[in-house]
């Protein structure tokens, strides 16, 4: 997260760290007791690594009573996701067992009504992604509030030049932004999951390159079918 600040510890009990061989790779969001939603591209470089999900964490390195690492039983990328585009960039991870819920571990309700979030709405994005252009990784969860940007502006030739589909949304990126390592994490508006940080190699913190988020409401049928 660029231009953000340390989050209040355990105030986002839905927040997940998707890890490969014990290292944070991407964010994720607990959407059901045994399922974490993330971005499809996140695991492309996982290769033959051991994928696990950390729940109940604030610090990645320090012991915390609520922290628990879960093995992943199953990784389900959206059937239309593919390595060379950010379209349909969603992944569902089934944990090896149901998460133990508590004040620091709780699924987040996700948006089912397929309607655009009002431009200008302030939404919260959190993650353990880099906090500087130099690539510094934080140990503790960071967050930032970002205004939603209308799709027409986001699609300007100077911005994303028509790449933003109806199934995506944008947020402003003027020095405050999600960045590498935040992919797969949640964009939360009014206490509801609206978007998932896409995992392209976009430049971060440049106002001409707004953050791109996959709209979960647009994928309600797919999410329901996998979770069923």
């Amino acid at each position: 997260i660029l231009g953000g600040r340390e989050a209040e510890a355990h105030a986002r009990p839905y927040m997940a760290s998707v890890q490969v061989n014990g290292e944070h790779l991407c964010g994720g969001v607990l959407v059901a007791e045994q399922w974490v939603l993330s971005a499809a591209h996140c695991l492309e470089d996982a290769a033959d690594g051991k994928v696990q999900v950390l729940l109940g964490a604030h610090s990645l390195s320090q012991p915390e009573p609520s922290k628990r690492l879960y093995d992943v039983l199953r990784a389900v990328p959206h059937p239309d996701s593919r390595p060379d585009t950010i379209d349909h960039d969603l992944l569902l991870l089934q944990l090896s067992e149901k998460a133990t819920l508590g004040p620091a571990v709780r699924p987040l309700p996700w948006q089912r009504v397929d309607r655009d979030v009002e431009p200008g709405t302030l939404c919260d994005v959190a993650g353990w992604g880099i906090v500087s252009h130099a690539g510094r990784r934080p140990d503790r969860l960071q967050h930032v509030l970002l205004p939603v940007l209308d799709r027409a502006t986001c699609n300007r030739r100077t911005h994303h030049d028509g790449a933003i589909t109806q199934r995506m949304m944008c947020a402003e990126s003027n020095r405050r932004d999600s960045c590498k390592g935040d992919s797969g994490g949640p964009l939360v508006c009014g206490g509801v999951l609206e978007g998932v940080v896409t995992s392209g190699s976009r430049v971060c913190g440049n106002r001409k390159k707004p953050g791109i988020y996959t709209r979960v409401a647009s994928y309600a049928a797919w999410i329901d079918s996998v979770l069923a």
Partner: antibody, heavy 120, light 112 residues
């Protein structure tokens, strides 16, 4: 660029031995599972063997047709994959491809192959 | 071992036609983790095979959307909506769910 280059193929007599090598470049070799796939002249593809990464204890798996005759190994420090083939049979005659295996277990990078001919 | 039966062995088509290739496994190829590791590869003459589809229906990088994979359990299909000259070659299905992994026998897509 991501690349796999096989070598070590050639003509060998039945019951003989041969060691194939595969040099990997352009990616983090040590994190990937690697495979050999072969193709007999004018025939289809046949999976031969797979070796996993260090994080999966270098576990190996073999096709029944090569079990106990072929041994798969890797040297992560040199980004090399090896296939030691012993007690070769005429039916082992084929083009041997070195193949990288991605997270979703697909074969996403293939070498150009090296030819093994087993004949007296 | 899981036997992968591909039909037809040869598929003559006209450019612009739809092509459909079937692949049937001798047993379910759902892995113990719930995923189905069913892939489709295309091998053009004199070249190494190239990945087209993974996890039954996910298209790989650079694969045109005229290629579509579908199926479940033991029955799988690759459809090419409008065949182009560059699509000609031998198509193989492959299962990576159960060791030993197995390929189908191949389907040669050729011009009528």
């Amino acid at each position: 660029a991501v690349q796999l280059v096989e070598s070590g193929g050639g003509l060998v007599q039945p019951k003989g031995s041969l060691k194939l090598s595969c040099a990997a470049s352009g990616f983090s070799f040590n994190t990937y599972a690697m495979n050999w796939v072969r193709q007999a002249p004018g025939k289809g593809l046949e999976w031969v063997a797979r070796i996993r990464s260090k994080s999966n204890n270098y576990a190996t798996y073999y096709a029944d047709s090569v079990k106990d005759r072929f041994t798969l190994s890797r040297d992560d420090s040199e980004s090399m994959l090896y296939l030691q083939m012993n007690n070769l049979k005429t039916e082992d005659t084929a083009m041997y491809y070195c193949v990288r295996q991605g997270f979703y277990w697909y074969f996403d990078v293939w070498g150009t192959g090296t030819t093994v001919t087993v004949s007296s | 071992d899981v036997l992968m039966t591909q039909t037809p062995l040869s598929l003559p088509v006209s450019l612009g036609d739809q092509a459909s290739i079937s692949c049937r496994s001798s047993q379910t190829i759902v892995h113990s983790n719930g995923n189905t590791y069913l892939e489709w590869y295309l091998q053009k003459s004199g070249q190494s095979p190239k990945l087209l589809i993974y996890n039954v229906s996910n298209r790989f990088s650079g694969v045109p959307d005229r290629f579509r994979g579908s199926g479940s359990g033991t029955d799988f299909t690759l459809k090419i909506s409008r065949v182009e000259a560059e699509d000609l070659g031998v198509y193989y299905c492959f299962q990576g769910s159960h060791v030993p992994y197995t390929f189908g026998s191949g389907t040669k897509l050729e011009i009528k």
